[in-house]
């Protein structure tokens, strides 16, 4: 059916499908260093890896994109492992004003599936 | 800052970047032919394309993601072309007294981002 | 509003481990993307942080203490909990939970709690 | 680890008038993006610290504005412009350019 379940083992071995991975990064790595003031160094969690047939599907369209993938793969590409969810993340940061704590809710992935 | 804004135009040349294709597809092609009764060819709208430096970036996420892709290629992906929003379709199906209209609201995409 | 508050022991016997765990209540510990921090003080003395947790379940410690400590979170409780490894007397201390942006701004505070250290 | 040095240790202080607490680092807390990473926090009798100023001089929210923090470098102040009866306790500063963060050893702030 259009809804068959996400396929949840890795088919290509530990490590290699689309999972999350911490990523360090400073400030200046962002370029972000002339406007925020802290954290200083981010935890910056990121999807990566493979996303073979069915693995993870975001949804119906991820399916059928697989499909059509084996079928023409020349014209459809494969999945590809991005968010599924955030997580928020706050900034201390320069304002106009002085300094300002804001939260920012797309910073951060907190998981991930194939789309 | 985080929410600068994502480039628009294809630095890769026309048709290279991050755009919505229609792919014909048979119901044959998707294995639905068994319970799908109509229509029995789809025309789906796909992402595909590639995801250069801030192109059509979907949030700050994807904005630091390209960023850090540029500094660790081998560590961290590029973002990639994926359905930014879906358009509605109704299938006519089997069901186990009958035949049913069923709307799939993320089978076909209506809008492509980079992510 | 979000509070913090220290549960624990208040008595450990010198070379075990002193566990404290501090539970956020009022709001959940994995979103705003905060770190949250140990910070002790000594008995009439000033005060030292001894580390933090992140989101991520990233830790940070303070080099002193790095061979004996461990932080680790629990989502699914909203809590997150310190481990002090062959503990002595001097690690006797009011032991505070608290909620900073990387490890400054602690702009919120467990109440404390008291762990003697004594046979 | 960077050594925060506060004076004075004790400091009495009459109701209405200013008073004024010195913090001293072992090295300079000014970063490159032109702040200095120095927070002050107060201790009332039997609670927990609370959050004064940070960032040298930025008030922390609902701290009312007779508390002001000034100072570049090595060399910081915490400034109240009228003492209150309610402002006794202990203050700290707290370095936060490096890890670990350290503390100064406190100024007991008690009424005459």
């Known amino acids: 059916s259009a809804h068959a379940h996400p396929r949840d083992s890795c088919p290509l071995g530990p490590g290699r499908c689309c999972h999350l991975e911490t990523v360090q990064a400073t400030l200046e790595d962002l370029g972000w260093s002339d406007w925020v003031l802290s954290p200083r160094q981010l935890q910056l969690s990121m999807c990566v890896g493979e996303c073979p047939h069915l693995y993870r599907s975001a949804n119906t369209h991820a399916q059928i994109k697989a499909r059509l993938h084996g079928l023409q793969p020349d014209k459809v590409p494969a999945p590809c492992c991005v968010p599924s969810s955030y997580t928020p993340v706050v900034l201390m940061h320069r304002t106009d004003s002085g300094v300002s704590l804001q939260t920012y809710d797309d910073l951060v992935a907190r998981g991930c599936h194939c789309a | 800052s985080a929410h600068a804004h994502p480039r628009d135009s294809c630095p890769l040349g026309p048709g290279r970047c991050c755009h919505l294709e229609t792919v014909q597809a048979t119901l044959e092609d998707l294995g639905w032919s068994d319970w799908v009764l109509s229509p029995r060819q789809l025309q789906l709208s796909m992402c595909v394309g590639e995801c250069p430096h801030l192109y059509r970036s979907a949030n700050t996420h994807a904005q630091i993601k390209a960023r850090l892709h540029g500094l660790q290629p081998d560590k961290v992906p590029a973002p990639c072309c994926v359905p930014s929003s879906y358009t509605p379709v109704v299938l006519m199906h089997r069901t186990d007294s009958g035949v049913s209209l069923q709307t799939y609201d993320d089978l076909v995409a209506r809008g492509c981002h980079c992510a | 509003q979000v509070q913090l508050q220290e549960s624990g022991p208040g008595l450990v016997k010198p070379s075990q481990t002193l566990s404290l765990t501090c539970t956020v209540s009022?709001?959940?510990?994995?979103?705003?993307?905060?770190?949250w921090s140990w910070i002790r003080q000594h008995p009439g003395k000033g005060l030292e942080w001894i580390g933090a947790?992140?989101?991520?379940?990233?830790?940070y410690y303070n080099p002193s203490l790095k061979s004996r400590v461990t932080i680790s979170v629990d989502t699914s409780k909203n809590q997150f909990s310190l481990k002090l490894s062959s503990v002595t007397a001097a690690d006797t201390a009011v032991y505070y939970c608290?909620?900073?942006?990387?490890?400054?701004?602690?702009?919120?505070w467990g109440q404390g709690t008291l762990v003697t250290v004594s046979s | 680890d960077i050594v925060m040095t506060q004076s004075p240790l004790s400091l009495p202080v009459t109701p209405g008038e200013p008073a004024s607490i010195s913090c001293r680092s072992s090295q300079s807390l000014l970063h490159s993006n032109g702040y200095n990473y120095l927070d002050w926090y107060l201790q009332k009798p039997g609670q927990s610290p609370q959050l004064l100023i940070y960032l040298g001089s930025n008030r922390a929210s609902g701290v009312p504005d007779r508390f002001s923090g000034s100072g570049s470098g090595t060399d910081f102040t915490l400034k109240i412009s009228r003492v209150e009866a309610e402002d006794v306790g202990v203050y700290y500063c707290m370095q936060t350019l490096e890890a670990p963060p350290t503390f100064g050893g406190g100024t007991k702030v008690e009424i005459k």
């Open positions: 608290a909620r900073g942006v990387e490890y400054q701004h602690f702009s919120l």
């Open positions: 009022g709001g959940s510990i994995s979103s705003g993307g905060y770190y």
């Open positions: 947790i992140v989101y991520s379940g990233h830790t």
